[in-house]
Interface confidence: low
């Protein structure tokens, strides 16, 4: 009978050896068998499972001239860059006839310095704010003890005594380095060193101190910054969109913010060059030598209305008998708010000044008192907003109306014989 067909007689003449090494090691397992007749294909098992994608080579050497003579078959399994997943019991397997033969086992073990699965990462934290760092290592050999170091000083006096995978740091007041050391019977491996940069805390209580049409004075309370004094604070203002889309936690607004820097202390800043009667959102961050704090949430604020910056334009005043027709155009200068209307004042040479609120119309017909013989009549107009009157125009003398001159149909304004109120003429 051909050798290897009887269950009690194994064809294997060389069994896999043992490999124990550190991660990354390259090694070879080898088994040898002697069979009669056509050499079988040698399969490799790890922990009883066939390795489908094994890096194996098979060499066959005939021991005679006839193919029915004995053959020596050598199979070599190459393990490149030993990993934990490679460890286990290895055997060779062959099918000979209707029988299956398995070699004696060899063992692959991993033993070396600890290997880091997770290492502490660089990060920034606000001063005096708790955070966690993670570190994880494995052998074999086990156990693997971790020792945390802060600025190279052990946080526990020996590995395994103190925090292990997760280090809870209750807060820092200076930028520090953290690393962890993993120890096992083979020695020590040190993780990367993580730099934890201590930034100032987010400022608090951002609020308005005073408001003017084109400037806002704001103040805030600085957060702790550890051992690093604040160098400056940065304030940003952005025009609010109509939908008030800037909410706490929403992404930055699309338009370019107006940015101002404040020397500190005091923790106060006058933000100028703003539009009057305009909604803004503002936020502040403070910076130390280590970097900037996080921004505060956007705070909605609004500049107040101002008075118009210029008088109405192109004032014309014409007289026709006992009526005077006055018209004008809106001021070219910024209104600094919502135009509520116009005030008009007129005065003769020897008569008291008469002041009228015209509303939003830009023309008015005055019904003059008496026979219309008032001499040297002049008219002034001012625009006003909720904040008050803008500057008055220069006095415009009343011109006599000439036939052919256009005079629109308009509402007559009959002035009372005694003015309701009177302003001094200037």
């Amino acid at each position: 009978a051909p050798r290897g067909t009887q269950a009690e007689e194994s064809p294997f003449v060389g069994n896999p050896g043992n490999i124990t090494g550190a991660r990354g090691l390259t090694g070879t397992l080898r088994c040898q068998l002697q069979v009669q007749g056509e050499p079988p294909e040698v399969h490799w098992l790890r922990d009883g499972q066939i390795l489908e994608l094994a890096d194996s080579t098979q060499t066959q050497v005939p021991l005679g001239e006839d193919e029915q003579d004995d053959w020596i078959v050598v199979s070599q399994l190459r393990i490149t860059s030993l990993q934990l997943s490679d460890t286990g019991q290895y055997q060779c397997l062959v099918f000979l006839g209707h029988q299956t033969f398995v070699s004696q086992p060899g063992y692959v073990g991993l033993e070396g310095l600890p290997y880091f699965l997770e290492e502490p990462e660089d990060r920034t934290v606000a001063a005096n704010t708790p955070f966690n760092l993670s570190c994880q290592a494995q052998g074999p050999p086990e156990p693997v003890d971790l020792l945390w170091l802060q600025d190279a000083v052990p946080l526990a006096t020996a590995p395994g005594h103190g925090p292990q995978r997760s280090l809870h740091v209750p807060g820092l007041n200076k930028t520090s380095s953290f690393s962890c050391e993993a120890h096992n019977a083979k020695g020590v491996t040190t993780s990367r060193t993580a730099t934890i940069t201590v930034l100032p805390q987010q400022p608090r209580n951002l609020h308005l101190v005073s408001r003017q049409p084109t400037e806002l004075e704001v103040a805030w309370t600085p957060g702790l910054s550890g051992i690093y004094p604040l160098t400056h604070c940065t304030l940003q203002a952005v025009l609010s969109d109509d939908g008030m889309g800037i909410q706490a936690g929403e992404p930055d607004p699309p338009e370019e913010p107006l940015t101002s820097q404040a020397s500190v202390p005091p923790h106060q800043l006058r933000l100028g060059s703003l539009h009057p009667h305009t909604p803004y959102h503002i936020r502040v961050a403070c910076t130390s030598s280590q970097g900037p704090s996080s921004w505060t949430h956007w705070l909605p604020v609004e500049t107040p209305e101002g008075v118009p910056l210029g008088p109405p334009e192109n004032i014309s005043a014409t007289r026709n008998g006992s009526q005077a027709f006055v018209h004008w155009q809106e001021p070219r200068a910024p209104l600094q708010g919502t135009l509520l209307g116009y005030r008009l004042a007129y005065q003769g040479q020897d008569t008291p000044e008469v002041l009228m609120d015209i509303g939003l119309r830009q023309e008015v017909t005055l019904e003059l008192q008496g026979d219309g013989s008032v001499s040297n009549l002049t008219v002034c107009v001012a625009a006003y907003t909720a904040a008050g009157d803008g500057p008055w125009s220069l006095p415009v003398p009343l011109e006599a109306w000439r036939p052919g001159q256009a005079q629109p149909v308009h509402q007559l304004v009959k002035e009372p014989s005694t003015p309701a109120f009177s302003w001094p003429w200037w």
Partner: antibody
């Protein structure tokens, strides 16, 4: 095998600085461990002075903090002790040592005797 | 700083005997005490660390025990080469501190 060897002057005048060198062979001082200076006064009292960690950070005995400096030259695998403003009280045998990963000292130098005298 | 009191400062014994040396810390140092042997012309030798862990290459006749504040070094069946100076050192916190030493001499 790891070996540590101290070297430096035998005699230092009061108020001067004491400078000692520890040369390490068989292990890189930047690979791991902490590298220490210890001194033994006449009468056998031992005092831990400080260390330089393999990362370059230092830790000193608070009793010496204002006078001590430990530095290193990684290219020569040496670390150094400088003790300023010495007095006769600093007369001692000075040792360098390496601390084990459980933070006790597993390798010591032979020691070098330093006398402070005018 | 942690003060370490070592006793006795002097001990005479014969080869084959068992001796003990004690160290007491001024406050708890957990288990972190080391023992060293000092001999003229040789470098100091670490015997025990973390209270009871025998350093590699040290004969098993040396043993350490204790935790908290009270620690003991025991040398059983003294050999002639064991007669030397012995020191304890706490490695629980910085600054590290040493005991005053025990001189073990042949009786």
């Amino acid at each position: 095998d790891v070996q540590l060897q101290e070297s430096g002057p035998d005699l230092v005048k009061p108020s001067q600085s004491l400078s000692l060198t520890c040369t390490v062979t068989g292990y890189s001082i930047t690979s791991a461990y902490s590298w220490h200076w210890i001194r033994q006064f006449p009468g056998n009292k031992l005092e831990w002075m400080g260390y330089i960690h393999y990362s370059g950070s230092t830790n000193y005995n608070p009793s010496l903090k204002s006078r001590i400096s430990i530095t290193r030259d990684t290219s020569k695998n040496q670390f150094f002790l400088q003790l300023s403003s010495v007095t006769t009280e600093d007369t001692a045998t000075y040792y360098c040592a390496r601390s084990l990963w459980f933070y006790a000292m597993d390798y010591w130098g032979q020691g070098t005797s330093v006398t402070v005298s005018s | 700083d942690v003060q370490i009191t070592q006793s006795p400062s002097y001990l005479a014994a014969s080869p084959g005997e068992t001796i003990t040396i004690k160290c007491r810390a001024s406050k708890s140092i957990s288990k972190y005490l080391a023992w060293y042997q000092e001999k003229p012309g040789k470098t100091n030798k670490l015997l025990i660390y973390s209270g009871s862990t025998l350093h590699s290459g040290i004969p098993s006749r040396f043993s350490g025990s204790g935790s908290g504040t009270d620690f003991t070094l025991t040398i059983s069946s003294l050999e002639p080469e064991d007669f030397a100076m012995y020191y304890c050192q706490q490695h629980n916190e910085y600054p590290w501190t040493f005991g005053g030493g025990t001189k073990l001499e042949i009786k």
